[in-house]
């Protein structure tokens, strides 16, 4: 039953003398395992014997024995699915039909495979894409319908006989579908590859040449152009003629249009390979190129820079930067269209030639106000000297100069006066817009740059002003020199350092903090009475009578100032003690009698002691001694002693007489 045998293998296999052939093959016998296999060369069916005749290249029997001469041909299959074969080496006379005679228990089958063996290695085949365009990556494929495990080969790419630098990727296929070796080369052709010969060379494992295939590359590319100019250096003078010629060195496909461009813009009505420029003007200077197009696109030549030479044009001056700040650096640039470039320059400042300045640029490292003005220049080249242009104005800005503060008042200024000051300056650029004053005060500015100080203080020593534009310039401070009466007059005790005791030597000083003018006079006064005209008031031996309220006065030409009243206090021991008796020195018994110890003391008496006629101290210590009821025996002389921090004082005796009352007399 033929439908039970299914085979898969390449239809035809290719090889050459001395190589080998590897035949990938699979089969399926539905009724069981393979029992017998014979490989025929050009088998023919014999109807008489009902068998196949032909050369038997390989035979396997049930016992698995293979004749020794069959080593060249190997059956690499198995009993149920693999029928792969190998012939190594393969010979020219192996060409033809191979017949695989397969037998199972009940079925038989003859499978035919074509084998094409050539005398010499056959060439590979180069496959090119339908179109190759410059700079577009393409893949070149070299295909050889051969591959065999026992015969390694290699495919090498050559360009104009030289191995190509690009890496090729080689792949092999030994499958039931196809047998081949393939090399793929990716590369980006340039226009110069057009017409060049590419070879794919088949080599054996040792690199020995076996065969090759060759193609000439057809690389589509934009026109490749060369531009020629007369004169060759493309340097002419106004009025000369120039000829430019565009040569197409290569174009594929053929070119269709020609045009000329200047500075990237197409020139109208110029559509031939020659561009004639007659009586050129300087405006025709620029970059010229020709453009030729084909179906791939436009090609452009290199640019030719046409220089039309002419004498310098009227110059202009560019200032970096104006306005300039005093002290900064400034650069002047002389700009004049000229070809060739100017070689010499003459510079002018306010119409006067600047000596030693012959360069295109003038650099002033430190600008001063006098540098301001109009700058102009003249450029010169080999063709002539240009005209002086209008020039450029340099504005030099600086802070106000020579700022002074001026006192408008007649001198001297007295405390309390109204003072007017003005802020003056010599020059300023830009103009002064405001003024500042130091120190700050609640002062009036009746007009710009004028300061009015009403009721000027004694301590308004100095005033400074600043005139301001973009910057402020301060004047040196001006002294107001305000005159005033002596200030802070006070009495100061110089000695003694401690409290004043009666008899001490005492010095008082009349002090003041300041006076303008400095020349002063002093006056001492006690209770409206003038005591002296020195700064000091001296007591050789102070007495309690010197105590009192003292003032000193200091005066100068502006006025006089009195100190606060200063109290002079003299400390002394109790004095002028006396005992006074109330109601009198004669008192009736039974009544009350009060003895008072009167004294003069500073500080006041702090402790009293009472004594009787026997100088016996009595147990009483207050200023008053109260006897109640008074007795006759109280009669006698009494005295008291007063004590303070300075010392003690005693009174003279005072006699108290106590007389009997009428009752006592009546009893007697």
């Amino acid at each position: 039953d033929s439908s039970k045998w299914v085979f898969e293998h390449p239809e035809t296999l290719y090889a050459w003398e001395g190589a080998c052939v590897w035949i990938p093959c699979t089969y399926r016998a539905l009724d069981g395992d393979l029992e017998s296999f014979i490989l025929f060369h050009n088998p023919e069916y014999n109807k008489n014997t009902s068998k196949f005749d032909g050369t038997r290249l390989y035979e396997s029997t049930k016992d698995g024995k293979v004749p020794s001469e069959q080593k060249r041909v190997q059956f690499l299959g198995d009993k149920n699915k693999n029928c792969t074969l190998s012939i190594h080496p393969v010979h020219l006379n192996d060409s033809g039909q191979l017949g695989l005679r397969m037998e199972s228990k009940t079925e038989k089958w003859m499978e035919r495979i074509h084998l094409n063996v050539s005398e010499r290695p056959f060439p590979p085949h180069i496959q090119l894409p339908p179109e190759i365009q410059e700079s577009q990556e393409v893949t070149l494929t070299c295909l050889l319908n051969f591959s065999c495990y026992g015969y390694p080969i290699q495919l090498q790419w050559l360009l104009e006989g030289v191995p190509m630098r690009q890496a090729a990727v080689t792949s092999t296929s030994l499958t039931i579908k196809s047998v081949f070796t393939r090399s793929e080369l990716k590369f980006s052709p340039q226009w110069s590859h057009h017409g060049k010969i590419v070879t794919c060379q088949l080599q054996d494992a040792d690199g020995k040449f076996l065969s090759n295939d060759t193609v000439q590359l057809n690389v589509k590319h934009t026109p490749k152009l060369e531009i020629k100019v007369t004169p060759s250096d493309a340097i002419v003078r106004e009025g000369d003629s120039v000829t430019m010629t565009c040569e197409v060195s290569s174009s594929n496909p053929e070119y269709t249009t020609v045009s000329w461009l200047k500075d990237g813009t197409s020139l109208k009505k110029q559509n031939t390979f020659t561009l004639n420029l007659r009586e050129v003007t300087k405006d025709q200077s620029g970059k010229y190129c020709c453009q030729v197009s084909n179906d791939v696109g436009p090609g452009r030549s290199e640019e030719v820079f046409l220089q039309v030479q002419y004498a310098p044009e009227p110059s202009t001056v560019q200032i970096l930067h104006s306005p300039a700040v005093e002290g900064s650096q400034v650069e002047f640039l002389c700009m004049s269209l000229a070809n060739p470039l100017p070689t010499n320059y003459t510079w002018y400042h306010n119409g006067k030639e600047m000596q030693g300045r012959t360069e295109e640029k003038v650099h002033i490292p430190k600008i001063l106000p006098w540098h301001a003005g109009t700058y102009s220049c003249v450029a010169e080249n080999i063709l002539g000297t240009g005209q002086r242009g209008p020039g450029a104005e340099l504005d030099v800005q600086y802070p106000p100069k020579k700022v002074t503060t001026v006192i408008q008042n007649p001198m001297p200024i007295r405390e309390g006066d109204t003072v007017t000051l003005s802020c003056n300056y010599n020059s300023s650029n830009p103009s002064v817009t405001r003024y500042e004053w130091k120190p700050h005060g609640a002062w009036e500015e009746p007009s710009l740059g004028v300061l009015k100080i009403q009721n000027v203080g004694w301590d308004n020593t100095t005033i400074a002003c600043a005139a301001c534009n973009s910057w402020c310039s301060w004047a040196s401070p001006v002294a107001l020199n305000v005159q005033y009466a002596p200030r802070d007059v006070r009495v100061r005790k110089i000695k003694p350092l401690s409290e004043i005791h009666s008899g001490n030597s005492v010095s008082l000083q009349c002090d003041f903090s300041s006076s303008h003018p400095k020349e002063v006079q002093f006056f001492w006064e006690k209770n409206g009475r003038l005591l002296g005209k020195e700064s000091q008031l001296n007591f050789d031996s102070i007495s309690p009578e010197d105590a009192g309220s003292y003032s000193c006065w200091v005066n100068n030409s502006i006025g006089q100032t009195a100190s606060k009243a200063w109290t002079l206090e003299v400390l002394y021991a109790p004095r002028r003690l006396r005992v006074s008796m109330s109601p009198g020195d004669q008192v009736m018994e039974g009544k009350s009698a009060t003895l008072t110890c009167e004294s003069d003391a500073n500080p006041p008496v702090s402790h009293y002691t009472w004594f009787d006629w026997n100088n016996q101290s009595l147990p009483y210590h207050s200023q008053k001694l109260r006897l109640e009821p008074v007795k006759v025996q109280h009669s006698g002389a009494y005295w008291c002693q007063g004590t303070n921090s300075v010392g003690k004082g005693r009174s003279p005796l005072s006699t108290l007489t106590v007389y009997y009352s009428p009752e006592t007399i009546g009893r007697r």
Partner: antibody
Framework: QVQLQQSGAEVKKPGASVKMSCKAS????????LHWVRQAPGQRLEWMGY????????EYNQNFKDRVTITADTSASTAYMELSSLRSEDTAVYYC?????????WGQGTTLTVSS | DIVLTQSPDSLAVSAGERVTMNCKSS????????????LAWYQQKPGQPPKLLIY???TRESGVPDRFSGSGSGTDFTLTISSVQAEDVAIYYC????????FGGGTKLEIK
């Protein structure tokens, strides 16, 4: 060995056309471009154009572009050059040639005489 | 197209003399991929097709006598015959094949 065998001499009248052949042998015809070059008496060699037999792509010298047609028959390994609107100045020897990497092969030439 | 200008147009020398002829190209014929100059020199005798003498500007074709040598690169090339023989009487053409093909006007060599 490589050979380029050209057809025999031609005599044509002005305004007519001529078609001459170049049979290649000894190499794979489709592998190389085939060029046509002419030489008028006492004049320099002048390239006319080529054909790539692999894909019939042609490229011509602009001077001949409107009058020349180059074709190829790969089965016969033969290239043809047809020149139309003949003028007396087309009187020349016409060569087919091809380049290999390191050499050039030339046909023996076909003489064309254009005369009234 | 690339224009080739040959000089001189003709020259007459005695047998055994050294002779040089020049070929100037309007553009470089150096091919950057293999650093070869795509310029050939031919000898053409009356009634014969051109015979290749030199390719790649300086490589002598096999079978060409070694008295013929080529030199130059880029745009300027020279063919030298070190010792002229009577059989060298011919027209010599230079040929660029970098881009399309163009030929020089030829230099005619005669023997005095």
């Amino acid at each position: 060995q490589v050979q380029l065998q050209q057809s025999g001499a031609e005599v044509k009248k002005p305004g007519a056309s001529v078609k001459m052949s170049c049979k290649a042998s000894g190499y794979t015809f489709t592998s190389y471009w085939l060029h046509w070059v002419r030489q008028a008496p006492g004049q320099r060699l002048e390239w006319m154009g080529y054909i790539n037999p692999r894909n019939d792509y042609t490229e011509y010298n602009q001077n001949f572009k409107d009058r020349v047609t180059i074709t190829a028959d790969t089965s016969a390994s033969t290239a043809y050059m047809e020149l139309s609107s003949l003028r007396s100045e087309d009187t020349a020897v016409y060569y087919c040639a091809r380049r290999d990497i390191t050499t050039f092969y030339w046909g023996q030439g076909t003489t064309l005489t254009v005369s009234s | 197209d690339i224009v080739l200008t040959q000089s001189p147009d003709s020259l007459a020398v005695s047998a055994g003399e050294r002779v040089t002829m020049n070929c100037k190209s309007s553009q470089s014929v150096l091919y950057s991929a293999n650093h070869k100059n795509y310029l050939a020199w031919y000898q053409q005798k009356p009634g014969q097709p051109p015979k290749l003498l030199i390719y790649w500007a300086s490589t002598r074709e096999s079978g060409v006598p070694d008295r013929f040598s080529g030199s130059g690169s880029g745009t300027d090339f020279t063919l030298t015959i070190s010792s002229v023989q009577a059989e060298d009487v011919a027209i010599y053409y230079c040929h660029q094949y970098l881009s399309s093909w163009t030929f020089g006007g030829g230099t005619k060599l005669e023997i005095k």
